[in-house]
């Protein structure tokens, strides 16, 4: 399925011409340009950047570039009434206060409008009480506290370390446990890699560095006030009490210098085991409360942030397709940052900018892609994927009929060790074939393919000689396209060595220290990893938009469906007695997977043999491929999560960042032994097996011969 058959082409206008036009030096220049001042969503600076990108994309040669604006709920600290946490003595005097801001990095001392660290969408409040240390505040951490250690978090302020799971899940878990406030902190065990210096001398987090971030539990809703519909000029907005996903208790993030002051006084129970100990010189006692002489001291939070409906701007660029203009391949990444956005998002935005420039150069030479390519610079991703979700809500009818694929383009790097790809199984073969054609940027792999270095450094746990490709979860702008609309999606970036660097994300994530210099000095001085990511993302878009037959292999879906069915069955089989008692059977699911496998195999055979010169048959076969992902969408959505509609994949209910397979069945089985009504609980398991089996069978039938 070569891309050389693109329209209006001379031989040079192929994938190679597109890739050769991508230049590391340009990406470097764009990154510098995008990172000199903060571009917080809803601010004038970010609006100006949107207009700059619009203007440059037009210059690069796109057919049209428009701004799409929405008025969404955002959250900001009160400029005159800062947020902080204090330790108070028995008289109510504040004997310790946390920092009000991060010490600015060298060269940025005079930059204005650096938003201080805060947890976006925290309600206002000044709770005071005893502290309980809750490790990562995961579901299993609260189970350990409540069930094993008999610690009641009700009415307590909990302190949790960042990492492992999305911060919004931590806050939700704390709320469910009855906490009245949450303090989030970065522990050096998770955000300080051994043997590396702190910024500005290295890429580690200094003690005064703090991770910002939203703490919503939107479950795909987009703007909290207009779930399901665009936040346009005539939108009906919910009252704040009915808003989706807002936390109900105050939350605030701190660095490890401040955390040390809180944790060193902790009393109560010893930590349950070493997995609860970080790297600070404190006992990591769980509490509740402070020990001995400090037992009369309490912790008090002072949170004064406000939620405000604010205008945001997406930039949408169009490169019209020559043959199938009504088929859309979308490349999108966000533009808004917490501060300078040196990695998140501008390392991604700079790559998108260079991809647009390369496509524009080809277009100016008379080339057009077969299908339409849409380029998006999303706003307000950091506030809950708002820009992408509102745009997709506004254009949902077009997207569900015309959307071929969505490629995400947030941060291009989170390390410089190897490639990391998360995508639909439909794209596995595309990614494999593309990376075999690209050169590896890795030291020691000169002259070798990217596929080879990737496979060596990140091998698949199931298939030898193949690289690991992960499930899509959420926490980024592909969410609405994949989880709600069922558009085949993928993402790629360069990552760290997960085996040797066990910290969560990269140490300076969402801090003021995420600067251009961080990237240029420590992560990618030659911008060779950025260039590789540009080639992967751009190459995927090129192939998706240009190949005559869509580069999707439905047989790979069959393989993973069987794997996921085996996995969920083995989870259920931990309860053999109940399965017998309640007549729980997975036969229907395994039968549907078997049918899918057989039908996919036959479809693939027909795909090799059909007459590609017949435009009607070609379109028919491509539509079956395009609509296969759509066939996994259940219009009713998952229980209590109506905007997560994909039956095969959803963000984990316990960690938004992670993908879960057969999420309906998984959630029905989760902690089932603790359910008060086992008959009802197992009834729900049976219902979810039925939904999954039906959906897989229905999807299989979309691949059958049409008549």
């Amino acid at each position: 399925k070569s891309s050389n058959e693109a329209t209006n082409i001379t031989p040079k206008h192929n994938m190679k011409a597109f890739l050769d036009e991508l230049k590391a030096e340009n990406i470097k220049k764009f990154l510098y340009n995008f990172t000199q001042i903060p571009h917080l969503a809803g601010t004038e600076q970010n609006f100006q950047l949107a207009k700059q990108i619009q203007s440059q994309w037009k210059e690069f040669g796109l057919d049209s570039v428009e701004l799409a604006h929405y008025d969404v709920l955002l959250s900001y600290p009160n400029k005159t009434h800062p947020n902080y946490i204090s330790i108070i003595n028995e008289d109510g005097n504040e004997i310790f206060n946390t920092s009000l801001f991060e010490p600015p990095p060298p060269g940025y001392e005079n930059v204005s409008d650096i938003v201080p660290p805060f947890s976006a969408f925290s309600p206002q409040g000044m709770p005071e009480g005893d502290l309980v240390y809750v490790n990562y505040a995961r579901t299993e951490d609260f189970f350990k506290l409540e069930r094993d250690m008999k610690i009641n978090c009700s009415g307590k302020i909990v302190i949790a370390r960042y990492g492992k799971v999305f911060r919004g899940n931590k806050v939700k878990n704390a709320q469910l446990a009855g906490a009245k406030g949450v303090i989030l902190y970065s522990d050096p065990a998770d955000y300080f890699a051994p043997g590396v210096k702190s910024y500005p001398d290295g890429w580690n987090l200094p003690g005064g560095g703090v991770q910002r971030g939203n703490i919503l539990n939107l479950n795909g809703a987009g703007d909290p006030l207009t779930p399901g519909y665009p936040a346009n000029e005539y939108a009906y907005r919910r009252g704040i009490a009915e808003a989706v996903g807002l936390p109900s208790i105050p939350v605030h993030p701190i660095g490890y210098y401040d955390a040390q002051k809180l944790l060193e006084k902790m009393g109560g129970s010893a930590p349950p085991d070493s997995s609860w100990r970080g790297s600070l010189k404190v006992p990591y006692n769980v509490g509740p409360g402070f020990t001995g002489n400090f037992s009369t001291q309490k912790v008090k939070m002072h949170i004064h942030s406000t939620n405000e409906v604010t205008r945001i701007y997406n930039v949408i660029g169009t490169l019209r397709g020559a043959v199938e203009p009504d088929r859309y391949v979308i490349l999108g990444g966000h533009r808004d940052s917490w501060v300078f956005g040196g990695i998140d998002p501008q390392s991604g935005a700079a790559v998108v900018h260079e991809i647009v420039r390369s496509f524009g150069t080809l277009k100016k030479e008379g080339w057009r892609p077969r299908r339409t390519i849409l380029f998006a610079s999303w706003d307000a991703e950091e506030f809950g994927l708002l820009g992408s979700t509102e745009w997709a809500e506004e254009n949902s009818r077009l997207l569900q009929e015309r959307g071929v694929a969505y490629i995400n383009a947030d941060s291009s790097i989170e390390g410089n060790y190897t490639l990391r790809v998360d995508c639909t199984p439909l794209m596995y073969s595309l990614v494999h074939n593309l990376t075999k054609e690209l050169k590896s940027p890795d030291e020691g792999f000169e002259g070798k393919s990217l596929y080879e270095s990737w496979t060596k450094k990140s091998p698949s746990p199931e298939f030898s000689g193949m690289p690991r490709i992960s499930k899509l979860g959420s926490g980024n702008d592909f969410e609405v396209f994949f989880q709600r609309l069922g558009i085949a999606s993928g993402r790629a970036r360069y990552t760290k060595n997960w085996e040797t660097n066990k910290f969560s994300g990269y140490p300076l994530y969402h801090s003021v220290y995420e600067t251009y210099e961080l990237v240029e000095k420590f992560y990618d001085p030659m911008f060779k990893y950025h260039l590789t990511v540009a080639q992967v993302r751009g190459g995927m878009v090129f192939e998706l938009a240009n190949s005559i037959v869509l580069p999707f292999d439905c047989r790979d879906y069959a393989v993973v469906l069987r794997k996921y069915a085996d996995k969920i069955y083995s989870i259920s089989m931990k309860h053999p007695q109940e399965m017998k008692t309640y007549s729980v059977s997975f036969d229907s699911l395994f039968s549907a997977v078997k049918n899918f496998t057989e039908i996919a195999s036959k479809f693939s055979e027909r795909l090799q043999d059909f007459d590609k010169s017949n435009p009607i048959v070609l379109r028919m076969m491509n539509d079956q491929l395009m609509f296969l992902e759509r066939a996994f969408i259940d219009p009713l959505g998952l229980p209590d999560r109506p905007f997560y509609r994909h039956v095969i994949y959803a963000p984990s209910s316990h960690n938004k960042y992670a993908g879960e397979s057969f999420p309906g069945i998984y959630d029905a089985l989760f902690d089932i032994e603790s359910k008060v009504d086992p008959s009802k609980a197992w009834g729900e398991v049976k219902r979810q097996i039925y939904v999954a089996a039906f959906t897989v069978q229905a999807a299989a039938e979309t691949l059958s011969e049409v008549a």
Epitope: E140, F143, K144, R147, D148, M149, K150, G267, G268, S269, A270, P272, D273, S274, S275, P283, N285, G289, T291, G292, S295, K574, E673
Partner: antibody, heavy 116, light 107 residues
């Protein structure tokens, strides 16, 4: 219902090793830490260490460090405690106990006798 | 290590008596103390945790109190089935440590 079933009594010679098993049932094995506590005849209970079955990481009482190894087999929902370089004073009943810091569920105990 | 010292080591009381066992920690442990009951030839059973909270199913004649270094287990009205050895345990610091036990008999 929750059950912790330990392996049977052992008689060992000084210098030998013993490995005691503890099979869990009625709950999700990986959700709860497993501890080992011993009791020599007429003596107090003595905490030896624990394992987090989810990660396989063990924490030990320094008194036994180097001699005790706690492991688990999640597929069999079983925890193991191996004590090496046995001496006569290691004669005791060895208990597995589920929990974190405090122990609500105990195995029935395994008597290990060290005698030449 | 934190030493837990119980007193008395043994005691004899009549059915219906109020019985008090004390436990002293060598350093402050806040309220991170549990009490266990062990009958001859049996495994220990959790009675009290967090110094004063009764475990599920434990009769309300058992109560605990204390914080810091001094802790007490009280049986308000001794019953024949309460004949056992009672152990305190601290879980404020590793290694977790137990008292030497108090053997309770019926007169």
């Amino acid at each position: 219902e929750f059950q912790l079933v330990q392996s049977g009594a052992e008689v060992k010679k000084p210098g030998a090793s013993v490995k005691v098993s503890c099979k869990a049932s009625g709950y999700s094995f990986t959700d709860h830490n497993m501890n080992w506590v011993r009791q020599a005849p007429g003596q107090r209970l003595e905490w030896m260490g624990l394992i987090n079955p989810n990660y396989g990481t063990a924490d030990y009482n320094q008194k036994f460090k180097g001699r005790v190894t706690i492991t688990r087999d999640t597929s069999a929902s079983t925890a193991y405690m191996e004590l090496s370089s046995l001496r006569s004073e290691d004669t005791a009943v060895y208990y597995c106990a589920r929990g974190s810091s405090l122990f609500a569920y105990w195995g029935q105990g395994t008597l290990v006798t060290v005698s030449s | 290590d934190i030493q837990m010292t119980q007193s008395p080591s043994s005691l004899s009381a009549s059915v219906g008596d109020r019985v008090t066992i004390t436990c002293k920690a060598s350093q402050g442990v806040d309220t991170a103390v549990a009490w266990y009951q062990q009958k001859p030839g049996k495994s220990p059973k959790l009675l009290i945790y967090w110094a004063s909270t009764r475990h599920t199913g434990v009769p309300d004649r058992f109560s605990g109190s204390g914080s810091g270094t001094d802790f007490t287990l009280t049986i308000s009205s001794l019953q024949p089935e309460d004949v056992a050895t009672y152990y305190c345990q601290q879980y404020s610091r590793y290694p977790l440590t137990f008292g030497q036990g108090t053997k309770l008999e019926i007169k």
